[in-house]
Amino acid sequence: ATKLTEEKYELKEGQTLDVKCDYTLEKFASSQKAWQIIRDGEMPKTLACTERPSKNSHPVQVGRIILEDYHDHGLLRVRMVNLQVEDSGLYQCVIYQPPKEPHMLFDRIRLVVTKGFSGTPGSNENSTQNVYKIPPTTTKALCPLYTSPRTVTQAPPKSTADVSTPDSEINLTNVTDIIRVPVFN
């Protein structure tokens, strides 16, 4: 049986989580991919997704999350910049394949963000604008926020009020002028 395994990342506030999710490129290269957070007892919540169909090497930014899908390599790169303590939690990459349920990619990421900055002097760590030069673009991505109950960590949600429908739409602002609002509601 497939075991759901976790990989832990311990980072400080202001730092960047940078992970890569490996997928079968022949099957999923142009499929829409998403980055989700999993809270105990709730359905996974989609925080950001690639376009539909997913574009090769085209950065999509939602708040502090940057997704880049490298079709030639079968790799989705996920970066969460300027981490906050509240970002701590369990995350996963998924591939949307309607009408089937989303396909989860290994491993889940257990992110632990702690207070205090422990970077190298002059490493540009807090100035994410300098580090991440993303081409100016305005992207509109439709994120189908449904997911299978089998990925619920404990019990199903008590209410479906917070579970978005496949028609939910996330408007991405111009990434050169991102409003730094909290990513998590």
């Epitope: 490996d22 079968t24 490129l25 491993d107």
Partner: antibody, heavy 119, light 108 residues
């Protein structure tokens, strides 16, 4: 418990061929990329090749490109490295390594198999 | 290709002392760095990944720091089993993923 067991090493003449195998157990094999890393006697570690979990993507070090072929059989949980046109400088201990699920680092290693290329 | 440079090549330390090993990348790799320990006749073992995170089962006397191009592995109080060769490795995006040439930590 993750276990990686290499086999197939030995003595081969320059220009010859050898096939290394790695039997994996203790994890969902097809969910993870796998790699070969080598170490020449008394030297440091050198990455050789990586294959994605599905086998659809492969990578090679320039020093072995066109001579070595990495492959995997997810039904048998095995990783292979076909080595052709071997040179003296390919002499090394070859390690099979599991790539972590979130990034290209190596979280588990086999014990290695020695390949000696000499006439 | 990113070049990883470790220093010093050899570090002589007495048991119980602190050891500080350095690793420099030829270009910025964010936190995409791992440290490995290798003892004679054995396979390498993962110590630290993501520059800071200790791998499962690694004692807390091992700690990693740094970002961008400069990284440090610190062993706060060397035990007899810590005398070994240590390698850093970058994993910024796609292979090739290069290793440093290693630092040998020997008994003073």
């Amino acid at each position: 418990e993750v276990q990686l067991l290499e086999s197939g090493g030995g003595l081969v003449q320059p220009g010859g061929s050898l096939r290394l195998s790695c039997a994996a157990s203790g994890f969902t094999f097809n969910a993870y990329a796998m790699s070969w890393v080598r170490q020449a006697p008394g030297k440091g570690l050198e990455w050789v090749s990586t294959i994605s979990g599905s086998g659809s993507t492969t990578y090679y070090a320039d020093s072995v490109k066109g001579r070595f072929t990495i492959s995997r059989d997810n039904s048998k949980n095995t990783l292979d490295l076909q080595m052709n046109s071997l040179r003296a400088e390919d002499t090394a201990v070859y390690y099979c390594a599991k790539v972590a699920g979130s990034n290209f680092f190596f979280d588990h290693w086999g014990q290695g198999t020695l390949v000696t290329v000499s006439s | 290709e990113i070049v990883m440079t470790q220093s010093p090549a050899t570090l002589s330390v007495s048991p119980g002392e602190r050891a500080t090993l350095s690793c420099r990348a030829s270009q910025s790799i964010n936190h995409n760095l791992a440290w490995y320990q290798q003892k004679p006749g054995q396979a390498p073992r993962l110590l630290i990944y993501g520059a800071y995170t200790r791998a499962t089962g690694i004692p807390d006397r091992f700690s990693g720091s740094g970002s961008g191009t400069e990284f440090t592995l610190t062993i706060s109080s060397l035990q007899s089993e810590d005398f070994a060769v240590y390698y850093c490795q970058e994993f910024i995006l796609f292979p090739p993923h290069t290793f440093g040439q290693g630092t040998k930590v020997e008994i003073k």
